[in-house]
């Protein structure tokens, strides 16, 4: 089986997580991703995803949350403004891909957030001014309200063959600003 | 602190093959995706290859993709670079990186590094 | 892959002096440009990320700036301890790739 470890990734309170999720760029580039949490004992919630298909460099904001798919770059962007101490969990990239089940994009990221500045000018401590660069233009996705009982399959890194490795179960459910609208038939 | 060794370096002919380790102290080895980073004498930096927290997720550099293995051993807080066929052009002072807390692609803390010479 | 291009490959300057860096990028690369600074015999250290963002306990001459395909490291007086080589780094897609490198030595 393959082994869920966890990317941890630690900031502050007011910083922006700005993570990258890697695919392969012919199969994955016009698919629908999404950024999911995972909490204990409960099947992995969809925050937010980008458009179907998925538009190259097109920014889509939920909340607090920023989607930006880079198909000529193979990869995801993912930014969490704002963060708040409550953010803290596990988190995820996926891409909707039916009827198959979603791959999982790179590993399970684990975020820490804790409380206050470090008092230096980190990496990261002015980029919560990230969100006002994003254009007016920025779309709100719908997210597919996908129900398969199946498994998560992990992408394969772009240099090795395509394998699909079950991981857990999944369930993608949707925030509650985000209009629930059944996308696969 | 954070604290990357390196080891495993020395000469070795055109063709043969090394074995490097890193090994890890003072953060969660596993929870970090890690790197290797060469430098050939008198030359600009070069990344070699990445592999991600689980070993799920591995990356390289054109010039050394299916001569070149990175693997890790969360376990032992190792990471390693089985290096075969090796060139004259491979020469060069090898880094264990990894990236800091918040980003990946960076690379922020180094290992002092290890000289790897392939000649004749 | 990204070639990034680094120049001049060497700067000559005197302590007090202003110096810029410039790195240009074969393709858009958004922000996603690191700047580091290594003296001989020594591992790289990591300076700036996100073009623009000064890691912690780097001192406040060294900037960065731009985005896209076009970057500046500007050190706004050169200190004794500056002279070394700086390279720039895009870790957008893979491969990450590095530019040249630009050697600060003493006029």
């Known amino acids: 089986a393959t082994k869920l470890t966890e990317e941890k990734y630690e900031l502050k309170e007011g910083q922006t997580l700005d993570v990258k999720c890697d695919y392969t760029l012919e199969k994955f580039a016009s698919s629908q991703k999404a950024w999911q949490i995972i909490r204990d004992g409960e099947m992995p919630k969809t925050l937010a995803c980008t458009e179907r298909p998925s538009k190259n460099s097109h920014p889509v904001q939920v909340g607090r949350i920023i989607l930006e798919d880079y198909h000529d770059h193979g990869l995801l962007r993912v930014r969490m403004v704002n963060l708040q101490v409550e953010d803290s969990g596990l988190y995820q990239c996926v891409i909707y891909q039916p009827p198959k089940e979603p791959h999982m994009l790179f590993d399970r990221i684990r975020l820490v957030v804790t409380k206050g500045f470090s008092g230096t000018p980190g990496s990261n401590e002015n980029s919560t001014q990230n969100v006002y660069k994003i254009p007016p233009t920025t779309t709100k996705a719908l997210c597919p309200l996908y129900t398969s009982p199946r498994t998560v399959t992990q992408a394969p890194p772009k240099s090795t063959a395509d394998v699909s490795t079950p991981d857990s179960e999944i369930n993608l459910t949707n925030v509650t600003d985000i209009i629930r609208v059944p996308v696969f038939n | 602190e954070v604290q990357l060794v390196e080891s495993g370096g020395g000469l070795v002919k055109p063709g043969g093959s090394l074995r490097l380790s890193c090994a890890a102290s003072?953060?969660?080895?596993?929870?970090?995706?890690m790197n290797w980073v060469r430098q050939a004498p008198g030359k600009g930096l070069e990344w070699v290859s990445s592999?991600?927290?689980?070993?799920?997720?591995?990356y390289y550099a054109d010039s050394v993709k299916g001569r070149f293995t990175i693997s890790r051993d969360n376990a032992k807080n190792s990471l390693y670079l089985q290096m075969n066929s090796l060139k004259a052009e491979d020469t060069a002072v090898y880094y264990c990186a990894r990236r800091p807390d918040d980003r990946r692609g960076l690379f922020q803390h180094w290992g002092q590094g290890t000289l790897v010479t392939v000649s004749s | 892959d990204i070639q990034m291009t680094q120049s001049p490959s060497t700067l000559s300057a005197s302590v007090g002096d202003r110096v810029t860096i410039t790195c240009r990028a074969s393709q858009s690369i958004n922000s996603w440009l690191a700047w580091y600074q290594q003296k001989p015999g020594k591992a790289p250290k990591l300076l700036i990320s996100d073009a623009s963002s000064l890691e912690s306990g780097v001192p406040s001459r060294f900037s960065g700036s731009g985005s896209g395909t076009e970057f500046t490291l500007t050190i706004s007086s050169l200190q004794p301890d500056d002279f070394a080589t700086y390279y720039c780094?895009?870790?957008?897609?893979?491969?990450?790739?590095f530019g040249g490198g630009t050697k600060v030595e003493i006029k």
């Open positions: 003072g953060f969660t080895f596993s929870s970090y995706s």
């Open positions: 592999i991600s927290s689980s070993s799920n997720y591995i």
């Open positions: 780094q895009q870790y957008g897609p893979y491969p990450y790739t």
